[in-house]
């Protein structure tokens, strides 16, 4: 569907004749009939198959015709047509004299006809003018026309309709060529499907307007690219909806079983070593002078075992007394009133006199120590173990059991947790934030499953005499760590006391 | 705004166990901070540190008492309970429970409830 | 373990006047871990003061600590009716935790 307009520009008749050569009296008082026809080779008169139209009266003899499109009149002349525009024409213009108002054809004499123009040739649609001029002996006719398609219509030959809209069945405009120009934040064949909003992810998300992004079941986030984790978890992640993957250090259903309490929460105080001993449990191994579950509290004086030689510690307002057993004597109980004829020397240590025979010193071998050679010799007590190792005795010498991620005789290097496969007996290795933790298979325990929890040398209390038993790691084996007075690897002889004396 | 609530029996014939409960409103007794305490008043006497309990299960008891103390704590009830053996006429006393959070201060006390062993 | 020995016993004041309460410690109380509470008849005690002079949020600014190592002071600027009762002082620093043995404060 379109429209082939025709613009009347000028029309010369300076001597104001008819056709036939007679002259209009008073003048030619012209109008203009249009026919509009399919292409003809020799035009011929026939049906107007594209359409006709007349004009009204528009000047007498030579004129100017005025544009009159803007004020709603004729010119250029519209020749609608509801057709594919074939791209080829037939036009028939003539000028007409009126001597009356009546217009019609049946109503003017036959030799009213002023003059005849006829063309044909090719025109393609669109919005440029064609200027032409056709002369005949009396008159001259300037004009131009075109083809442009009715609203809705496009395409070179107004065949495509399209119809602009912004609604349920489509967001679009239309291109000079009737193709759809979806409107911004549309796309589709019909501009019906909006754009998310940009970065939204392709399956999780989705939108009903542009620029949005509304989530499917199970993601989250502004662009729909994050999991929802199962309802509940506490210290996890997901990759994929509902699931619940611990952070380390966090196990359980949901991810709230506290695995490393000690790297969570800090809770030991005054230089205290933590443990984790199990889900949401800890130990603090204290520093001397210090206790309280969190180490938070100091010693009172007797509790750190200040008393030697036996001696016994009373708690007292101002502090604490030491109540000495016979034969010592001083603020710990650190001085002896035997001599060395009284052989106070354990465990083959050797005596020495010291002030003229007043006091003795004993000499002792080693592994042994004490002012009576009556402690074996704790290696330990000088915490050689480096980052939180723990010191085991071994005889004569002692050795460190490092904490995960450390090594070398005193734990002194840092080794890179899990690296080494540090877990024994098949443990499996988890990397903590401070170090790592071992998972150790049934029958096995300690920090890197090398604990045999189904032996424990010390479960039989081998030692006699109150004795203090202590497993063997290695060997599976116990020692004994005899009380005053006691000797043998079990702590079952006495040793020979020194007779006592009358004072 | 927390709340602590004693309850147990307000009498306790000698030798036997005196059994107190406390129970924890308006807090979660999984407070990593808290220290959860039983503190005891005798009559017209001053106050006496029984001992305390951690959500973890961690405990430290005054070495006074500790022979004869049991304290233990149900985080699925959010309470803590004391038990003392081996009751005497001695133990007759007002038992508070208490919590303190960090630092030994008591910020926040049950009302109290007075046990009387007697036979 | 530590004692505290409270002293006066009893101090009788009149509202508005100016108290001071003593806590003497048997040993040093190491970095100043020691409370004051105000206890009332019929009632638990009240948190006043922590770390010897620090003020628990929603006490009267009339009520402040001092003090050090074994000597300890609880002040009162100006009495206020509701503020005679029984006071505690209490170590924190050491086990097992104690406290003094009161000081009461009634009307004059």
């Known amino acids: 569907s379109g429209v082939f307009q025709l613009q009347l520009q000028e029309f010369i008749n300076e001597r104001g004749v008819l056709a036939s050569g007679r002259p209009c009296e008073p003048g030619c008082r012209t109008f203009f009939r249009v026919c509009l026809k399919h292409f003809q080779a020799v035009v011929s008169p026939g049906p107007c198959t594209f359409g006709t139209v007349s004009t009204p009266v528009l000047g007498t003899n030579s004129f100017a015709v005025r544009d009159d499109s803007s004020g709603g009149g004729r010119n250029p002349l519209q020749l609608p047509f509801n057709f594919t525009w074939p791209g080829t024409f037939s036009l028939i213009i003539e000028a007409w004299h009126a001597p009356g108002d009546d217009l019609r054809p049946e109503a003017l004499p036959p030799d009213a006809l002023i003059s005849k123009i006829a063309i044909q040739g090719s025109l393609a649609v669109g919005q440029n003018w064609l200027l032409d001029e056709q002369t005949s002996t009396l008159t001259r006719l300037r004009y131009s026309y075109r083809v442009i398609c009715s609203d809705n219509y496009y395409g070179d030959n107004c065949s495509r309709l399209c119809k602009k809209r912004n609604d349920h069945f489509g967001h679009y405009v239309c291109q000079p060529d009737g193709n759809l120009s979806c409107l911004p934040g549309w796309t589709g064949e019909y501009c019906q499907q909006p754009i998310c909003l940009s970065g939204c992810h392709e399956q999780n998300g989705y939108c009903s307007k542009p620029a949005e992004c509304l989530c499917r079941p199970g993601w989250q986030g502004r662009l729909c690219n994050e999991c929802i984790p199962h309802n509940g978890c506490r210290h996890g992640t997901c990759s994929t909806p509902w699931q619940c993957t611990c952070d380390e250090g966090w196990g359980g259903l949901f991810c709230d079983q506290d695995l490393n309490y000690c790297t969570h929460h800090s809770p030991c105080k005054n230089g205290a070593t933590c443990s984790n001993s199990g889900q949401r449990s800890y130990t603090c191994t204290c520093r001397p002078g210090y206790t309280g579950v969190d180490c938070e509290l100091e010693l009172s004086e007797c509790d750190s075992n200040p008393c030697r030689n036996g001696g016994s510690c009373k708690d007292q307002e101002d502090g604490y007394h030491c109540l000495c057993p016979p034969g010592y004597y001083g603020l710990h109980c650190e001085h002896s009133t035997l001599s060395c004829a009284d052989s106070p020397c354990f465990n083959g240590g050797s005596c020495r006199e010291r002030n003229q025979g007043a006091n003795y010193a004993c000499e002792c071998p080693p592994n042994f120590t004490g002012s009576n050679c009556e402690k074996k010799v704790d290696r330990c007590t000088s915490n050689p173990c480096a980052n939180g190792g723990q010191c085991l005795n071994r005889g004569p010498s002692r050795m460190c059991r490092c904490r995960p991620g450390f090594t070398g005789t005193y734990c002194e290097l840092h080794v890179s947790d899990c690296a080494r496969n540090p877990c024994a007996h098949g443990g499996t290795c988890h990397d903590l934030e401070n170090g790592l933790m071992c998972t150790c298979p049934a029958g096995f325990s300690g920090r890197r499953c090398e604990v045999r929890t189904s032996i424990d040398a010390c479960a039989s209390s081998p030692c006699f005499n109150r004795a203090t038993c202590y497993t063997d790691l290695s060997t599976d084996t116990f020692v004994c760590n005899c009380p005053y007075g006691f000797v043998g690897s079990r702590c079952e002889f006495p040793v020979g006391l020194p007779p006592s004396f009358p004072w | 705004q927390v709340q602590l609530q004693e309850s147990g029996p307000g009498l306790v014939k000698p030798s036997q166990t005196l059994s107190l409960t406390c129970t924890v409103s308006?807090?979660?007794?999984?407070?990593?901070?808290?220290?959860w305490t039983w503190i005891r008043q005798h009559p017209g006497k001053g106050l006496e540190w029984i001992g305390y309990?951690?959500?973890?299960?961690?405990?430290h008891y005054n070495p006074s008492l500790k022979s004869r103390l049991a304290i233990s704590v149900d985080t699925s009830k959010n309470q803590f309970s004391l038990k003392m053996n081996s009751v005497t006429a001695a133990d007759t006393a007002k038992y508070y429970c208490?919590?303190?959070?960090?630092?030994?201060?008591?910020?926040?006390w049950g009302q109290g409830t007075t046990v009387t062993v007697s036979s | 373990a530590i004692r505290l020995t409270q002293s006066p016993g009893t101090l009788s004041w009149s509202p508005g006047e100016r108290a001071t309460l003593s806590c003497r410690a048997s040993?040093?109380?190491?970095?100043?871990?020691l409370a004051w509470y105000q206890q009332k008849p019929g009632q638990a005690p009240r948190l006043l003061i922590y770390?010897?002079?620090s003020r628990v949020a929603g006490i009267p600014d009339r009520f402040s600590g001092s003090g050090s190592g074994t000597d300890f002071t609880l002040t009162i600027s100006r009495l206020e009716p509701e503020d005679f009762a029984l006071y505690y002082c209490?170590?924190?620093?050491?086990?097992?935790?104690?406290f003094g043995q009161g000081t009461k404060l009634e009307i004059k």
């Open positions: 770390g010897a002079s």
């Open positions: 040993q040093s109380v190491s970095s100043n871990y």
């Open positions: 208490a919590r303190a959070r960090g630092s030994h201060t008591f910020d926040v």
């Open positions: 309990i951690k959500y973890t299960g961690g405990i």
């Open positions: 209490q170590q924190y620093s050491r086990s097992p935790i104690t």
């Open positions: 308006d807090d979660s007794i999984n407070n990593v901070e808290s220290y």
